[in-house]
Interface confidence: low
């Protein structure tokens, strides 16, 4: 029963940023990156972040504005960013938080208004993920996992 192979993204997926450890303020990603002793711990923390993201309208905000009242660095930045969930069924974890710039320009620190003479750009980092690689039909053999590094947006910065 051969069928056409499924289209798969190989290494260009853009998973979300590294997760915070226990007892740390979640999703304050720029200041909270840390190494993980075990892949399981890393993946579990990613899952927790995704759950928070699903439950938080604040984190998924799409407005270009700075909010100095919030503790989250992503909303206090002059190039603020929010998070979306990057879903890829062939990847483990399947869901990853991904930074998304909220402004085309940057926020002018004096006027607190968007200034289009500057540009907000994503900052990328590499994170470890596992990919399920399945032979196309006819599948003579099982799917396999491969550990790969994928480039992801972890935040945004302002450039001239």
């Amino acid at each position: 029963q051969p069928r056409s192979p499924k289209s798969k993204r190989k290494g260009q997926g853009r998973p979300g940023p590294l997760a915070p450890g226990p007892h740390q303020v979640p999703l304050d990603l720029v200041s909270r990156m840390k190494p993980y002793a075990r892949m399981e711990e890393y993946e579990r923390n990613i899952e927790e972040m995704v759950a928070q993201l699903r439950n938080s309208s604040e984190l998924a905000q799409r407005k270009c504005e700075v909010n100095l009242q919030l503790w989250m660095s992503n909303k206090r930045s002059l190039s603020p960013w929010g998070y979306s969930i990057n879903h890829d069924p062939s990847r483990i974890p399947v869901d990853l938080p991904e930074a998304r710039c909220l402004c085309l320009g940057c926020v002018n620190p004096f006027t607190m208004q968007e200034d289009r003479s500057m540009v907000s750009v994503p900052v990328f980092s590499q994170v470890p993920v596992r990919r399920r690689l399945c032979p196309p039909p006819p599948r003579t053999g099982p799917c396999r996992q491969r550990a790969v590094m994928e480039t992801i947006a972890v935040g945004c910065t302002c450039i001239f």
């Epitope: 069924p89 099982p142 799917c143």
Partner: antibody
Framework: QVTLKESGPGILQPSQTLSLTCSFS??????????VGWIRQPSGKGLEWLAH???????YYNPALKSRLTISKDTSKNQVFLKIANVDTADTATYYC??????????WGQGTSVTVSS | QIVLTQSPAIMSASPGEKVTMTCSAS?????MYWYQQKPGSSPRLLIY???NLASGVPVRFSGSGSGTSYSLTISRMEAEDAATYYC?????????FGSGTKLEIK
């Protein structure tokens, strides 16, 4: 915790259709790369792979039995089904279902015994 | 289909003895898998991808081989290792199992 459990009629007569159900928990058959297969073992004999179904509904059958086999799944109920048409005494065996992913059959059900007798 | 021939069909070993059983494939296969089955129980995965130990399997078990010739070794036989061992290939349909090697304790 991953578990699989097979169920079947126990006894049936030659020429009837054998219907087997594999009920599982701890994983989803909608997960990319996941599969569930059926293997049987006549008493005191070796293992024989029968059929397999993948997460995307891709199906494979043992060519020696293909004309008599039908595998299907109900992803929402976490179940996989196998039908064997026109059974005879040679189909008497213990039938196992097992999860296949990432290269091996790691999780197996406890098996269900099927006897074909007139 | 690829036929897997296991030898010996039956063997016995004393506790502490080294045990080696083989699996010969009628055509070249990429990897071999080994399962242990005790009477009244389901098969249990021991070795995957020829030489990798499955989770929870004692380190006295090891696998090796390539092409058409593969083997499973128990470095020091223990009473609980008495069982039937099956090799299996995934390299081409239909997936096939060997006829088994029954290992008894002396």
């Amino acid at each position: 915790q991953v578990t699989l459990k097979e169920s079947g009629p126990g006894i049936l007569q030659p020429s009837q259709t054998l219907s087997l159900t594999c009920s599982f928990s701890g994983f989803s058959l909608s997960t990319f790369g996941m599969g569930v297969g059926w293997i049987r073992q006549p008493s005191g004999k070796g293992l024989e792979w029968l059929a397999h179904i993948w997460w995307d509904d891709d199906k494979y059958y043992n060519p020696a039995l293909k004309s008599r086999l039908t595998i299907s799944k109900d992803t929402s109920k976490n179940q996989v089904f196998l039908k064997i048409a026109n059974v005879d005494t040679a189909d008497t065996a213990t039938y196992y279902c097992a999860r296949m992913n990432d290269g091996y059959l790691y999780y197996w059900g406890q098996g269900t015994s099927v006897t074909v007798s007139s | 289909q690829i036929v897997l021939t296991q030898s010996p069909a039956i063997m016995s070993a004393s506790p502490g003895e080294k045990v080696t059983m083989t699996c010969s494939a009628s055509s070249s296969v990429s990897y071999m898998y080994w399962y242990q089955q005790k009477p009244g129980s389901s098969p249990r995965l021991l070795i995957y991808d020829t030489s990798n130990l499955a989770s929870g399997v004692p380190v006295r078990f090891s696998g090796s081989g390539s092409g058409t010739s593969y083997s499973l070794t128990i470095s020091r036989m223990e009473a609980e290792d008495a069982a039937t061992y099956y090799c299996q290939q995934w390299s081409s349909y239909p997936f096939t199992f060997g006829s088994g090697t029954k290992l008894e304790i002396k």
